[in-house]
Each structure stands twice: as structure tokens, then as C-alpha cells.
């Protein structure tokens, strides 16, 4: 192999290793892949064709500021997808349409700072969606009932400052149980926001400037769910 | 199979009220697969679209910036319907107006009703 | 996705193939659906989500969608295929239906 990834057990290392394109000398069976530290501007999906195997793919800390759909046709396996800390700014319907097994995106440190549209609405086996240190000014991702299973939505250091509920009631048929909305400057909990999401678990407000009159009606508004 | 009737009046004064029903049959107003909306065709012009309704925990409604002071979109789910009332209307609204069922996920039009053409004038 | 521009008009002879554009910013970032229109009838969904045919849509109708275009494709095309075609897509920022100014397609 001329690439200078380490690889065992099907897994991949090809981190920290200053590469600027997806290795194509690696064994055709694995099933991780981890390119996290490199020099990585895009992700050619036919560079991904050989390791069609893939369960897990990890990216981070990289270059990237578009993703080709056509990404997760290659992948059909892909159930964990790590994006963190690169420089997507649009996430469009197509972005993950193919990506219908995940059930780990994690988004976080990117520069999203509005989800329009339905980007997650084929993502029916997620389970974490990681979001935070985003731009995202609320809390809305999407247009219609979607993210059935989804059990952990992590927005913290976001631009959020109210929770309303037509944002959160996409989660109706969902099973929310973790809502980590830490260090954003929330001043506005509307009425009936946490209807959709009443099985919460945990509600992390770290570094949350609340203060008596919105924590008053925070309670309140978690005793009506 | 989906089926979208269109009832209401074909003629209509300017400065009053447009009122169209639309009956569904085949599927539900209330699902959560589909949202529901207006659309009309001026005589020789294109499709322009007027606005849908559609239900997550509670009803929404998203109107085309050009009609949005006077247009209302509502469910009836006892009669399993939609209607669509169009204020202060003017001759420029004479069209012919189509109900429709916008599919998830992505909002194709996958089902019309048969239209009713609106005439506007004294 | 707040406008897209189709031809008024495109002619073709029978048989031949025809294909009718939809331009807009960035448009296949968008899934773009197509609709046919006969004179006095309702549009009929003809192409979805880029290139997907709903069921009793002839083979002959495909659809394509990348980079700032979107096109319609009618192979073989026949005289009842003779009709409007528009183009559509939504975003939920602006409007749920946008719509093209639609395209007349002659069979000569």
C-alpha cells in the first residue's frame, strides 16, 4: 500500500496524514474508515466506490464545504457519518437522501446557519444528530413530521433564542430523549413547545442565562407536557 | 385511489369573497404523508400557486406572498375537506383555481382536482 | 428556489426526442418535478423527484437534474404528447410550489 494509512480488522486509520484525496489502495473490505486531520476539500463519491462495506466514515477536521449525494449510493452500509469541524455552510434535500441507514450524523462545528427545506427527512434509523457550535438561529429542521427514531438532537453553541413549538413538533413521532440546547442565548420559551417532545429525558441548559421569570415558565411549560 | 372534487361558485363580484371547497376522497386531510393546497391558471397564463395547509402536532398554512393579506386556507376534518377563501378579489383573479395533494417528502403534486374556473366581474 | 425559467416553445417531430429545460439558481441542489398539461385538463405529474416516473407515465418521459438545469425528456416522442409542460419545485423560505413559466410542446 502506498498510502501510509494503518489498517486492522477492517478498520482504516488514514488520519493526520496531510492527504488531499481519498486513498483508492486500500483493502476493498473495510468496514471504517477514519480520515479525520487531513487536507480534504471534497468527497468524490466515485472514490468511494470500492469501499462499498463502509459502516462508518469519519471526516472530521477537514476542508469540506460540499458533499456530492450520490456520496451515500456508494455506501449503502454507511451507518455512521462524522462531518465535524469542516465548512459546510447549505445542507439541500438531497444532501443525505441516500444516506437512508444512518443512525450517527454528527455536524458539528460546520457553518450552518439555517436548515431550510427537509435535509434529514430520509433519515428514519437516526439515532444522534449533532448539530452544535452551528450558526443556527432556531431550532426548526424541517417541514413535516420526520426523525422517527431519533433519540439524542445536540444544538448547543447555536444563535437559538426561543423554542417554539411549530419548530419541535417535526419530533411528534419520534422518541426525543435528549435535548442539549447548552450555551445559546435562549430567551423565549413559547407555549406548548415541548408538546411533541413530552418524553424527553434530559433538557441541558448549561451556560444558559435564564434567570427567575424564564425559568418560571420553563417549568410550566414542561409540568403541561 | 385519491379523488379531489372542487365545489363553489363560478361567478363572483369584485370586491367580494372567492369561497371553493375541496372534498377528498382516497386519503385523509389530517395524514401526515401529504400536505394540501390551491393553485390557479389565469386564462392563457402558467400555473401560480396560492398556498397549502398541513399538519404536524397542529395546522399550517404557508400563502404565496402575492395573495397572503387575502387569502385562507382551512381544514374540515369532519367532512374530510379543505377550502380556500380569497378576499376583496378583483378581475385580475379570474383564473381557474385547482385544489391538490402535495406528496411528502419533497412536494410533487401527485393528485388535482378537476378545476373550477372563477370569473370575476359585475 | 424562488424562479425558473423554461423555453415558451419547443417543436419536434415525431419520433424524434424532445427536451425541455428548467433553469434556476443552483437548481440541482432542488428535486424538480414535471407536469403535463392538455388543453382544458388538469396537469398531470409526469416526471418526480428529478427522474422518477409515477406509475402509468410511458417509459419514453425521463427526467434529469444537475448544476443550474433541470430537463424533461421525451424520447420517441408521439402527437399526444402534444401539450404544456411545467416544471416545479419548492423551498420552504419562499414558496411551496414554484413553478416555471411553462413550456408548449409541438409535435409537427
Known amino acids: 500500500s502506498t498510502t501510509k494509512c494503518t489498517v486492522s480488522h477492517e478498520v482504516a486509520d488514514c488520519s493526520h496524514l496531510k492527504l488531499t484525496q481519498v486513498p483508492d489502495d486500500l483493502p476493498t473490505n473495510i468496514t471504517v474508515l477514519n480520515l479525520t486531520h487531513n487536507q480534504l476539500r471534497r468527497l468524490p463519491a466515485a472514490n468511494f466506490t470500492r469501499y462499498s462495506q463502509l459502516t462508518s466514515l469519519d471526516v472530521g477536521f477537514n476542508t469540506i464545504s460540499k458533499l456530492e449525494p450520490e456520496l451515500c449510493q456508494k455506501l449503502p452500509m454507511l451507518k455512521v457519518l462524522n462531518l465535524q469541524h469542516n465548512e459546510l455552510s447549505q445542507l439541500s434535500d438531497k444532501t443525505f437522501a441516500f444516506c437512508t441507514n444512518l443512525t450517527e450524523l454528527h455536524l458539528m462545528s460546520n457553518s450552518i446557519q439555517k436548515i431550510k427545506n427537509n435535509p434529514f427527512v430520509k433519515q428514519k434509523n437516526l439515532i444522534t444528530l449533532d448539530l452544535s457550535h452551528n450558526g443556527l438561529s432556531s431550532t426548526k429542521l424541517g417541514t413535516q413530521v420526520q426523525l422517527e427514531n431519533l433519540q439524542e438532537l445536540l444544538l448547543s453553541n447555536n444563535k437559538i433564542q426561543a423554542l417554539k413549538s411549530e419548530e419541535l413538533d417535526i419530533f411528534a413521532n419520534s422518541s426525543l430523549k435528549k435535548l442539549e440546547l447548552s450555551s445559546n442565548q435562549i430567551k423565549e420559551f413559547s407555549p406548548g413547545c415541548f408538546h411533541a417532545i413530552g418524553r424527553l429525558f434530559g433538557l441541558f441548559l448549561n451556560n444558559v442565562q435564564l434567570g427567575p421569570s424564564l425559568t418560571e415558565k420553563l417549568c410550566l411549560e414542561l409540568a403541561n407536557t | 385511489q385519491v379523488q379531489l372534487q372542487q365545489s363553489g361558485p363560478g361567478l363572483v363580484k369584485p370586491s367580494q369573497t372567492l369561497s371553493l371547497t375541496c372534498a377528498i376522497s382516497g386519503d385523509s386531510v389530517s395524514s401526515n404523508s401529504a400536505a394540501w393546497g390551491w393553485i390557479r391558471q389565469s386564462p392563457g397564463r402558467g400555473l401560480e400557486w396560492l398556498g397549502i395547509i398541513q399538519i404536524r402536532s397542529k395546522w399550517y398554512n404557508d400563502y404565496a406572498l402575492s395573495v397572503k393579506s387575502r387569502i385562507t386556507i382551512n381544514p374540515d376534518t369532519s367532512k374530510n375537506q379543505f377550502s380556500l377563501q380569497l378576499n376583496s378579489v378583483t378581475p385580475e383573479d379570474t383564473a381557474v383555481y385547482y385544489c391538490?395533494?402535495?406528496?411528502?417528502?419533497?412536494?410533487?403534486?401527485?393528485?388535482w382536482g378537476q378545476g373550477t374556473l372563477v370569473t370575476v366581474s359585475s | 428556489q424562488s424562479v425558473l425559467t423554461q423555453p415558451p416553445s419547443v417543436s419536434v417531430a415525431p419520433g424524434q426526442t424532445a427536451r425541455i429545460s428548467c433553469s434556476g439558481d443552483n437548481i440541482g441542489s432542488y428535486y424538480v418535478h414535471w407536469y403535463q398539461q392538455k388543453p382544458g385538463q388538469a396537469p398531470v405529474l409526469v416526471i418526480y423527484e428529478d427522474s422518477e416516473r409515477p406509475s402509468g407515465i410511458p417509459e419514453r418521459f425521463s427526467g434529469s437534474n444537475s448544476g443550474n438545469t433541470a430537463t424533461l425528456t421525451i424520447s420517441g416522442t408521439q402527437a399526444e404528447d402534444e401539450a404544456d409542460y411545467y416544471c416545479q419545485s419548492y423551498d420552504s423560505q419562499f414558496s411551496f410550489g414554484v413553478f416555471g413559466g411553462g413550456t408548449k410542446l409541438t409535435v409537427l
Open positions: 391538490a395533494r402535495y406528496s411528502y417528502p419533497f412536494y410533487s403534486i401527485d393528485y
